[in-house]
């Protein structure tokens, strides 16, 4: 027999099938050109010394074989003696080590058996009524197909499913969608209405995430504010990675869960942009402002559950001097300037009203003045910080005010508003005899003492009404009592107390007259 022809003789080996688990399988035969045909198969088991024979029986009952040696693929023409227009039955017999192994048979009409391609290119995946819908372009000249899918999860083996008949330029398949595990899908096609014809190869894997993206399960910490007025948000625990089926473990598109960090700066509400979303890998630096943070998980089906946090404001800035000068026209603040063309946000809020919204003002970009200071002024009419109470002031700075992560804290301090000089005057000044030449002076704390860092000191003034001599005694801001000594009996004195801030001398309290009685000896 010629090698290019099917040999109508008995094959050169005994005909018995050993029935072993190894051997030839998955035989498929199809037309590859107008007159050319191909059969191919898999061989399971050790291949050394194996000879393959493709067997063919015609409808007349006559049978022939092609000897292919160790090859598991054979091409032949319509002149090889095999009828291509009528139904034939084909199988493979593999001879090795004095035994024969036989593949399952396929019965088909070779001329009509076109090798179908699996879905190629982009397979679109979407969710439809709790199921998975896959859609793809029908390969050229292959309209009319039966389609099957197989799918597996990280913990299960392949399960086969049917997509049903397809008869259009686009084909689609409805498949089961898992709630909480990723899946790998593959698709294959064959010619519609030719049960004996062979299936195409399986398509490339289609990797599908679970319907619900996993909970982020992230842990954060925030560092303390640095000298530059910024603090780093750090990720202590990464989100748990999704377990993937075998074919999806490379850089498989479609299955990934993306995590995004959403920042909302609560302080300084008058700035241009309050919210920013960035990838979780990009851990930002933050100012000392208060923030709300969310980590949002999403996959190809949309957003999943999120995780939320609040980052309280960090008010522990380096001691930066804030000078406040109050004039007839209004009030001006001065502080050490940042770089050229910096925008500042000045925010203030009455102490004890932290729950309410703070008032804030955004300056135009400004350069440092000749003394290296930045300024902000307001008129008395504006009513800003006009009430006689303690205000918490925070100043933020940014050269790029529209970029939320580029703000920094310049300073955080307290200021007593309104007429602090008068409002801070100590009341209830009282004098008590202490000894023969000294008295104890007490007073109620100044309102300024409710404002951290505002009250610099008390000054107690004592005037001798006879000689008009005046002495002044500085007192720590935490004290509300002082002892005046070296006083003379029988002399009238007046005592007054004032409360001073770093930038403002307070108003004296009402004069309080006293004298030490002359002691008459017996």
């Amino acid at each position: 027999c010629r090698t290019s022809e099917c040999c109508f003789q008995d094959p050169p080996y005994s005909d018995a099938d050993s029935g072993s688990a190894s051997g030839p399988r998955d035989l498929s035969c199809y037309r590859i050109s107008s007159a050319g045909y191909e059969c191919s198969w898999q061989y399971e088991g050790p291949t050394a010394g194996v000879s393959h024979f493709l067997r063919c029986c015609l409808s007349s009952g006559r049978c022939c074989y092609f000897a292919t040696g160790s090859a598991t693929r054979l091409q032949f023409s319509d002149q090889a003696g095999v009828s291509v227009l009528h139904t034939v039955t084909l199988w493979v017999e593999s001879w090795a080590r004095n035994r024969t192994e036989k593949s399952p048979e396929v019965t088909l009409q070779l001329y009509k058996s076109v090798k179908y391609k699996p879905p190629l290119g982009d397979i679109k995946v979407s969710k439809l009524a709790g199921q998975l819908r896959m859609e793809w372009e029908t390969p050229d000249n292959q309209v009319g197909a039966e389609v099957q899918f197989r799918h597996r999860t990280p913990s299960s083996s392949w399960k086969l499913g049917d997509c049903g008949p397809q008869d259009d330029d686009t084909e689609s398949c409805l498949c089961p969608l898992e709630m909480n595990v990723a899946q790998e899908f593959q698709l294959r096609r064959r010619r519609l209405g030719s049960q004996g014809s062979s299936w195409s190869k399986w398509s490339s894997p289609v990797c599908v995430p679970p319907e619900n993206p996993p909970q982020p399960q992230v842990r954060f910490s925030v560092e303390q504010l640095g000298r530059d007025g910024r603090r780093r948000l750090t990720l202590k625990e990464q989100p748990t990675q999704l377990e993937l089926p075998e074919g999806c473990q490379g850089p498989a598109p479609g299955v990934e869960v993306t995590y995004q960090l959403q920042l909302h700066m609560l302080s300084c509400p008058c700035k241009a942009k309050a919210t920013r979303t960035l990838p979780l890998e990009k851990m930002p630096y933050l100012s000392g402002a208060a923030y709300n943070v969310a980590v949002i998980s999403s996959n190809r089906f949309g957003p999943g559950p999120n995780q939320t946090w609040h980052i309280p404001a960090d008010t522990h800035t380096e001691p930066v001097a804030l000078n406040i000068s109050v004039g007839t026209n209004g009030t001006t603040m001065y502080w050490p300037a940042r770089a050229q063309s910096t925008t500042y946000c000045i925010e203030w809020q009455p102490v004890g009203q932290e729950g309410s919204l703070a008032t804030c003002n955004l300056t135009a970009p400004q350069d440092p003045d000749p003394a290296g200071m930045a300024t902000y002024s307001w008129s008395r009419e504006s009513g800003a910080m006009g009430q006689e109470k303690c205000y918490h002031i925070t100043i933020f700075a940014s050269a790029h005010p529209k970029k939320l992560t580029l703000w920094s804290t310049v300073l955080s301090t307290y200021h007593f508003g309104g007429n602090a000089s008068a409002a801070g005057t100590p009341h209830h000044v009282s004098v008590k005899n202490h000894s023969l030449d000294s008295v104890s002076v007490d007073w109620a704390p100044s309102l300024l003492s409710t404002c951290p860092g505002v009250l610099k000191e008390y000054v107690v003034r004592c005037r001798d009404e006879d000689s008009n001599q005046v002495s002044e005694h500085p007192v720590q801001p935490t004290e509300t009592q002082v002892t005046l000594s070296d006083l003379r009996a029988g002399v009238a004195y007046t005592v007054q107390v004032r409360a001073d801030t770093a930038w403002l001398r307070g108003a004296w309290s009402q004069p309080q007259r006293f004298s030490i009685k002359v002691q008459v000896s017996d």
Partner: nanobody
Framework: QVQLVESGGGLVQAGGSLRLSCAAS????????MGWFRQVSGKEREFVAG???????YFADSVKGRFTISRDNAKNMVYLQMNSLKPEDTAVYYC??????????????????WGKGTLVTVSS
């Protein structure tokens, strides 16, 4: 392993007050951010209040101005003072903890340790 035990729940009239306590053991308490969450049956657990190791606090909008949270690091205790209680404050209140610096989780999945809860019932 941190253990948390809540106490102080009970029945109270609308407008009344209640103070919940949470005793913590088994960890460096001052390093933990502590929080109170509440849950009505059939609904998700919701954030009520949180406090950092240095006593920065944060409250849900629904309780702002009515509830205060405080901690005593020496005694390993966290407190939730609830004033002007309303019927809609009725829930099981849970104490929760996470080892974190300066960040208060406001969703339950941000917390690592939980107490068993104490029931607060506000009658109208």
């Amino acid at each position: 392993q941190v253990q948390l035990v809540e106490s102080g729940g009970g029945l109270v009239q609308a407008g009344g007050s209640l103070r919940l306590s949470c005793a913590a053991s088994g960890g460096p308490f001052s390093g933990y951010v502590m929080g109170w969450f509440r849950q009505v049956s059939g609904k998700e657990r919701e954030f009520v209040a949180g406090i950092t190791g240095i006593s920065s606090t944060y409250f849900a909008d629904s309780v702002k101005g009515r509830f205060t949270i405080s901690r005593d690091n020496a005694k390993n205790m966290v407190y939730l003072q609830m004033n002007s209680l309303k019927p809609e404050d009725t829930a099981v209140y849970y104490c929760a903890a996470v080892n974190s610096f300066g960040v208060i989780p406001t969703s339950p999945n941000g917390m690592d340790y939980w107490g068993k809860g104490t029931l607060v019932t506000v009658s109208s």
